[in-house]
C-alpha cells in the first residue's frame, strides 16, 4: 500500500510570465495543497514539459476551459 502521509507534494514557486498557445498544451492539473505556498496550475505541453501558471490569470483560465472542452469531444 502506498504511504499517502509521506507522498511527495508538487508545488509551484514561480509562474511563467509568458502566455502559452493552447495548441501546445495537452493537459493540466491544479495544485491546491495547503503545503504549497501558492495555488497553481501545472500545464503539461504536447512535448511533456510541465509549466507552472497562475490560476488568477485569464489566459490560464481560458486555456483550462479549452482543455476541458476537448475532453468532451469524442475521439474517433
Amino acid at each position: 500500500q502506498p504511504d499517502a502521509i509521506n507522498a511527495p507534494v508538487t508545488c509551484c514557486y514561480n509562474f511563467t510570465n509568458r502566455k502559452i498557445s493552447v495548441q501546445r498544451l495537452a493537459s493540466y492539473r491544479r495544485i491546491t495543497s495547503s503545503k504549497c505556498p501558492k495555488e497553481a496550475v501545472i500545464f503539461k505541453t504536447i512535448v511533456a514539459k510541465e509549466i507552472c501558471a497562475d490560476p488568477k490569470q485569464k489566459w490560464v483560465q481560458d486555456s483550462m476551459d479549452h482543455l476541458d472542452k476537448q475532453t468532451q469531444t469524442p475521439k474517433t
Epitope: S27, Y28, T32, E39, Q61, D62, M64, D65, D68, K69
Partner: nanobody
Framework: EVQLVESGGGLVQAGGSLRLSCAAS????????MGWFRQAPEKEREFVAV????????FYSNSVKGRFTISRDNAKNTVYLQMNSLKPEDTAVYYC????????????????WGQGTQVTVSS
Amino acid sequence: EVQLVESGGGLVQAGGSLRLSCAASARTFSSYRMGWFRQAPEKEREFVAVISRSGGDTFYSNSVKGRFTISRDNAKNTVYLQMNSLKPEDTAVYYCAAGAQIGWAEASTYDYWGQGTQVTVSS
C-alpha cells in the same frame, strides 16, 4: 480549500420554478469549472449542468435541457441553477461542485462539493 454552500431549494408544484444558488469561498473562484449534480433517493448521483470558467460554455444533461439554465457571477463567487417547468422526477438533493481537474461533466473531475439542497416537486 474551497467551501461551497447551496441555497434556494424547497417544495414546489409541478410546472413551477426554483433558482438554486451556490456561494463559493474560493479566492480564485473564476479558475474553477462549476457544475450541478443531483441525487434522488435510491439512485446514483447524476450530472445536471456545467459551466466553464468564463461562463461562455455550458452543457446540460438531456433530462433538463431546455428547462434548466446554469449561470455564474465571478464577481460574487456564485453559480446559479434556474429550474423551470419542474417535474416530479426532478425531486432530488442538488449539489454544487467545483472542478479543479481536467474534465467536463464527469463527477470524478470535481474536487469540491457542497452539502446539497433538497428540491421536492409535487404533482
